[in-house]
């Protein structure tokens, strides 16, 4: 056979054996002569023109450009292509020689104890196991193990060719660890060398860097970056890194395969980049690439190298945070620093700890902010290495939408005697204070409370047309007083009052307060009655364990069937934006009470007595009287508040003081409690007696010592006592200077 095409000047080398295939027996001598037109060389199997000892290439005796190849005692392994060619050209002549060695039918590469075949698990892919034959027409099968399986040529996808080897679809042997070819000659079996099966994959699922972001160090520290490639099974991986300072002395790269869990369809490879002592020039982007040959994936992270540990607040750090009651407040700490600082939060100087309402850390979180959360919050950052500290103050202002104090106490319907002057009050608490409080009104009959028309049980008034109180046409004559500001329960509140000159018409009044974060309203049912009247005996608010009587007085010529009821146990709910339910329409929700009836010439008086009043007794009491003629029921409501008993308490301290003789000392001792305590003063544990120079005023609250003398020096005690006990405060008064002698003799 010829390889290459003859050029104009050169003919192909000519072989002494003019055939493509030569078959000879083992142990015979192979001799082929090649003639040509210029310098020739030979190539033969297993030694591509090397110095094989058994092969002899000699110059022909009869001519130039002629070489003879001789192999004495050929063996099966000498099977293959013998090529004669012109040096430095592609012009060649080839003969394929089969050395039939029935004891060794497979050609083995001299160096091979075993071979390797690489396969993919691709269903469509075939693989060739290169078990070449020294005999062209052998009966060859392929054995795979373990478990042992035998494959025989099927004339289709499984075949054996003596010059090529055994061809088989790769998936058929992908399970096997090794394969070999086997030939049967005269009932004898001959095996090729073993071929190890290596299944090759290529797919990389992902490449992950760890730490994945925000890698920060300071000069001299060690940088360790891990790059993990997750791949399908049977993949080999090349790693490479790209980083800023490529000429690094202390860089270490370690690549290794991670152990694959059994049953896992994934393999992991790890490459670790280590720089023992980073410098500023190591700052920058670090990229790790993993490659299988058919697929490359990479990932990057930025490494920041600081000159030294530091800490500072970021520019985005807030100084004022505004929130509305009930909201979740988040104050994030914005800092620059390495390493990450320790963070401590303080409120008004007191350390804050995490609990169910507050979470402290990189973000201060107040779950449901309330007014008491208002204040100055200090965050202190401490660098864990240098111990450098930075602090920043955040002022939290908590806004409160208008809350109308009376709403929580309000009776469902208050009744007012016809013709009387009445004052309606709205006490508003809001932060910031309301920018306006407006009053509106509506006639009661414009809001009928018939079940068919009712909007809902809790909001039975289907009224919408509220009118401004300036327009009191058809209603009661009204005057709105200027808002007043009062300190109530330690809170600054805005009080708006509406004066009804004469209670002539039953109406609904609404006060509406608005500030920057919301609005609040209160609806007052102003029910005018010519009916019964309720009074309290004694007319002060009772304290626990005191007795009180509720008197309901009605003209006996007009009314009959006087009855006391109590609203309870809870008043009817009054939701925001809803109106109170008229009591007379809901008597079935009330408790009927025992009472005693008295009569005089004009009135019936129904007395309900509460002996030893308790806090449970407070609430709304309703007196119902029936019109003798029309049988219409008239209801009057009175709210009873029972004051809690509170042990005496002295607010404020008495201060020690030094005074000169002849001067005046004025001290005050304010006590609270229920029942109100009695105040007494003592000097050096003796009751202080008033005289011309010692004056006690305002129920002993204020002590004045005029023209002090040396003997006024001592320990002064203010003691407040009630049936619930005593409270006391003390101060030492020092009197300086010499006493002037008075000569009266």
């Amino acid at each position: 056979a010829s390889v290459g095409l003859p050029s104009v000047s050169l003919d192909l080398p000519r072989l002494s054996i003019q055939k493509d295939i030569l078959t000879i027996k083992a142990n015979t001598t192979l001799q082929i002569t090649c003639r040509g037109q210029r310098d020739l060389d030979w190539l033969w199997p297993n030694n591509q023109s090397g110095s094989e000892q058994r092969v002899e290439v000699t110059e022909c005796s009869d001519g130039l450009f002629c070489k003879t190849l001789t192999i004495p005692k050929v063996i099966g392994n000498d099977t293959g292509a013998y090529k004669c060619f012109y040096r430095e050209t592609d012009l060649a002549s080839v003969i394929y020689v089969y050395v039939q060695d029935y004891r060794s039918p497979f050609i083995a590469s001299v160096s091979d104890q075993h071979g390797v075949v690489y396969i993919t698990e691709n269903k469509n892919k075939t693989v060739v196991i290169p078990c070449l034959g020294s005999i062209s027409n052998l009966n060859v099968s392929l054995c795979a193990r373990y478990p042992e399986k035998r494959f025989v040529p099927d004339g289709n996808r499984i075949s054996w060719d003596s010059k090529k080897g055994f061809t088989i679809p790769s998936y058929m042997i992908s399970y096997a660890g090794m394969v070999f070819c086997e030939a049967k000659i005269n009932d004898e079996s001959y095996q090729s060398i073993m071929y190890i099966v290596v299944v090759v994959g290529y797919r990389i699922y992902d490449v992950v860097l760890s730490p994945s972001h925000g890698v920060e160090l300071s000069v001299g520290e060690k940088l360790v970056l891990n790059c993990t490639a997750r791949t399908e099974l049977n993949v080999g991986i090349d790693f490479n890194w790209e980083y800023p300072s490529s000429k690094h002395q202390h860089k270490k790269l370690v690549n290794r395969d991670l152990k694959t869990q059994s049953g896992s369809e994934m393999k992991k490879f790890l490459s670790t980049l280590t720089i023992d002592g980073v410098t500023r020039s190591d700052q920058g982007l670090y990229t790790c690439a993993a490659s299988s040959g058919l697929m490359t994936k990479k990932n990057s992270t930025f490494v920041r190298v600081h000159e030294k540990p530091f800490v500072a607040f970021g520019s985005g750090m807030e100084s004022l945070v505004e929130a509305t009651v009930g909201e979740r407040v988040r104050i994030p700490v914005k800092y620059l620093g390495y390493p990450p600082p320790e963070i401590k939060w303080y409120k008004n100087g007191i350390p804050l700890e995490s609990n169910h309402t507050v979470k402290v850390g990189h973000v201060l979180t107040i779950m449901e902010v309330s007014e008491r959360d208002t204040g100055n919050y200090t965050v202190i950052l401490t660098n864990p290495i240098s111990k450098e500290k930075q602090s920043h103050v955040v002022s939290l202002v908590v806004y409160v939408p208008p809350q109308i104090g009376e709403k929580s106490l309000i009776s469902p319907v208050d009744s007012y005697q016809y013709g009387t002057t009445q004052t309606l009050t709205c006490t508003v608490y809001a932060i910031p204070p309301p920018h306006h409080i407006h009053w509106y009104w509506q006639l009661e009959e414009e809001c009928p409370n018939e079940p068919s028309q009712a909007v809902s049980v809790t909001n039975p008034y289907p009224c919408e047309e509220w009118r401004s109180v300036e327009d009191f046409q058809g209603g009661n004559k009204i005057e709105v007083n200027k808002n007043q500001f009062a300190l109530i329960e330690g809170k600054n509140k805005t009080v708006s009052t509406l004066v009804i000159q004469a209670a002539n018409v039953s109406a609904l009044y609404k006060c509406e307060a608005v500030n920057k974060v919301g609005r609040g309203e209160r609806v007052i049912s102003f029910h005018v009655t010519r009916g019964p009247e309720i009074t309290l005996q004694p007319d002060l608010q009772p304290t626990e364990q005191e007795s009180v009587s509720l008197w309901c007085t009605a003209d006996k010529s007009t009314f009959e069937n006087l009855t006391w009821y109590k609203l309870g146990p809870q008043p009817l709910p009054v939701h925001v934006g809803e109106l109170p339910t008229p009591v007379c329409k809901n008597l079935d929700t009330l408790w009927k009470l025992n009472a005693t009836i008295f009569s005089n010439s004009t009135n019936d008086i129904l007395i309900m007595e509460l002996k030893n009043a308790s806090l449970q007794d407070q609430g709304d009491y309703v007196c119902v009287a029936q019109d003798r003629k029309t049988k219409k029921r008239h209801c009057v409501v009175r709210q009873l508040t029972v004051l809690e008993r509170v042990a005496p308490m002295i607010t404020g301290n008495l201060e020690n003081q030094t005074t000169s003789i002849g001067e005046t000392i004025e001290v005050s001792c304010t006590a609270s409690g229920n029942p109100p305590p009695q105040i007494m003063w003592f000097k050096d544990n003796e009751t202080l007696v008033e005289d011309s120079g010692i004056v006690l005023k305002d129920g002993n609250r204020n002590l004045t010592i005029r023209r002090v003398r040396k003997e006024d020096e001592g320990l002064y005690t203010c003691q407040a006592c009630s049936v619930l006990g005593c409270a006391k405060v003390e101060a030492f008064f020092i009197i300086e200077g010499a006493q002037e002698k008075t000569n009266l003799e």
Partner: antibody
Framework: EVQLVESGGDLVKPGGSLKLSCAAS????????MSWVRQTPDKRLEWVAS????????YYADSVEGRFTISRENAKNTLFLQMNSLKSEDTALYYC??????????WGHGTTLTVSS | DVMITQDELSNPVTFGESVSISCRSS???????????LNWFLQRPGQSPQLLIY???TRASGVSDRFSGSGSGTDFTLEISRVKAEDVGIYYC?????????FGSGTKLEIK
């Protein structure tokens, strides 16, 4: 700007050998897999060979297995394709292509190999 | 090997119109990771191929949003809206689900 410039294409006789080169610039060569893809005279594209970033892993099309060798020299930003025992069916325009995530995102302009006697 | 089939020519299209180029695979290109490994390339006259779409529907960097890819496991479509003169060339699809990665024979965009 990413650039791939192939060279070395020539007219070769069947059975002959040739080495193609691809000079890369404008990117970090050692961080990308590289491939050779050829376009036959009838305009069909055929993947030829691929190599991993460090050169440890190579893949070949069945049609060139055992005859072609892909290699790279990262220090010189160069990709090679050594072609032996050339056949007439190897006649094509040979492109070198950059690979990331399996995708050939940049291709050179190609170099022509003609195998003919 | 996975066979990729393409029509030699597209339906003739006028500039400004839309055109669809189809590609069929002998095997599903939906891999077990849930991704479909099909790419589209454009080879303009006298130029080398340029990656347009990868993973069936993701546009390569710098590719106009007039190009969009879609399909199922074996049937794929490249849609070009408002065709321009610069879109003329041969469109190749390529599978990456199985080695060796194979290309379709290419579809030439035909202009009326």
């Amino acid at each position: 700007e990413v650039q791939l410039v192939e060279s070395g294409g020539d007219l070769v006789k069947p059975g002959g050998s040739l080495k193609l080169s691809c000079a890369a610039s404008g990117f970090t060569f050692s961080m990308y897999g590289m491939s050779w893809v050829r376009q036959t005279p009838d305009k069909r594209l055929e993947w030829v060979a691929s190599i991993s970033i460090g050169g440890s892993y190579t893949y070949y099309a069945d049609s060139v297995e055992g005859r072609f060798t892909i290699s790279r020299e990262n220090a010189k930003n160069t990709l090679f394709l050594q072609m032996n025992s050339l056949k007439s069916e190897d006649t094509a325009l040979y492109y070198c292509a950059r690979e990331m995530d399996g995708n050939y995102d940049y291709w050179g302009h190609g170099t022509t190999l003609t195998v003919s006697s | 090997d996975v066979m990729i089939t393409q029509d030699e020519l597209s339906n003739p299209v006028t500039f400004g119109e839309s055109v669809s180029i189809s590609c069929r695979s002998s095997k599903s290109l939906l891999y077990k990771d849930g991704k479909t490994y099909l790419n589209w390339f454009l080879q303009r006259p006298g130029q080398s191929p340029q990656l347009l779409i990868y993973l069936m529907s993701t546009r390569a960097s710098g590719v106009s949003d007039r190009f969009s890819g879609s399909g199922s496991g074996t049937d794929f479509t490249l849609e070009i809206s408002r065709v321009k003169a610069e879109d003329v060339g041969i469109y190749y699809c390529q599978q990456l689900v199985e080695y060796p990665f194979t290309f379709g024979s290419g579809t030439k965009l035909e202009i009326k």
